[in-house]
């Protein structure tokens, strides 16, 4: 029985050239988290946080992705192409997989502000 819920930063916007924090939080379950996968809209893996092995940032993103804070991910030097969906997937036992979705909009305008409100998708 999957009782947990994933809370995410929901829909966020950030400035081109700036950075943004992608955050997911798993709550309402006692399941063990063995790994968290971060994926981009085209399903390519950005990073993995394994409970035993720690962080692995995939080579294509090494220059622009920083691990943390916590199980989150920091995207740096944002470009317009970074606009899109991001997914966090929690591998847990005995519950299985939980998936959260974040939509990032990268804006040219200096008006863009990073909103870090938590939402349940």
């Amino acid at each position: 029985m999957m009782t947990g819920t994933i809370e995410t930063t929901g829909n966020i916007s950030a400035k081109k050239g700036g950075s943004v924090i992608l955050q997911c939080h798993l709550s309402s379950t006692m399941a063990q988290v063995t790994q968290v996968n971060w994926e981009q809209h085209d399903h390519s893996l950005l990073a993995i946080r394994n409970a035993e092995l720690g962080w692995h940032i995939y080579p294509a993103f090494k220059d622009r992705v920083a691990p943390g804070p916590g199980l989150g991910l920091t995207l740096q030097s944002l470009t317009m192409n970074d606009t899109g969906e991001y997914f966090c997937t929690y591998h847990t036992y005995p519950d299985g997989t939980y998936r959260g979705r974040i939509f990032l909009e990268v804006l040219e305008s200096s008006v863009a502000e990073h909103s870090a409100r938590f939402q349940i998708p």
Partner: antibody
Framework: EVQLVESGGALVKPGGSLKLSCAAS????????MSWVRQTPEKRLEWVAT????????YYPDSVKGRFTISRDNAKNTLYLQMSSLRSEDTALYYC????????????WGQGTSVTVSS | DFQMTQTTSSLSASLGDRVTISCRSS??????LNWYQQKPDGTVKLLIY???RLHSGVPSRFSGSGSGTDYSLTISNLEREDIATYFC?????????FGGGTKLEIK
Amino acid sequence: EVQLVESGGALVKPGGSLKLSCAASGFTFSNYAMSWVRQTPEKRLEWVATISSGGSYTYYPDSVKGRFTISRDNAKNTLYLQMSSLRSEDTALYYCARWLLSLYAMDYWGQGTSVTVSS
Amino acid sequence: DFQMTQTTSSLSASLGDRVTISCRSSQDISNYLNWYQQKPDGTVKLLIYRTSRLHSGVPSRFSGSGSGTDYSLTISNLEREDIATYFCQQGKTPPYTFGGGTKLEIK
């Protein structure tokens, strides 16, 4: 080239014990979770156990929980399955497989070792 | 537990045919569906993971699709080396259950 070679299969009596081994090569063993999967005489596949890369986490289906123990020796690149209180329904071909959490799948399998539980 | 059902246990087709093998889960598995190929000698290989993603080294004639509870594996141009039994498996929630398999034979 990823290689997984199982051994230790045998004919055992009901209630008996057996330890299976799986020798891994061609990849950094300590970086991967590993699993045992069995194939029954009726050709059905059943997941039996999974162990995390460092061995801290082990997972089992209810059918084998408390009777089977998965373990690993990362220094020896070897995966184990200790089976006790064996039953006739444990008769199967036992495969070891690499469990890739980034794929949510078992990406490489061994050739299997046969376990027969019969009096 | 999630029950995985492959309604067709055996399938006969001719070389060059387009073959589709189906798999149904008892609950929504959110595309965490894998396909494995078992050759007559017992060798097992991962073909497709996460419903539609081809594992490395797998020929492009293999493809996967589906969502929710219904999934399928398609071989677009059947070759002799494709003669095998195909199993689906859900990777969403333990226990990681498999379908009963579909044995593919040549007509």
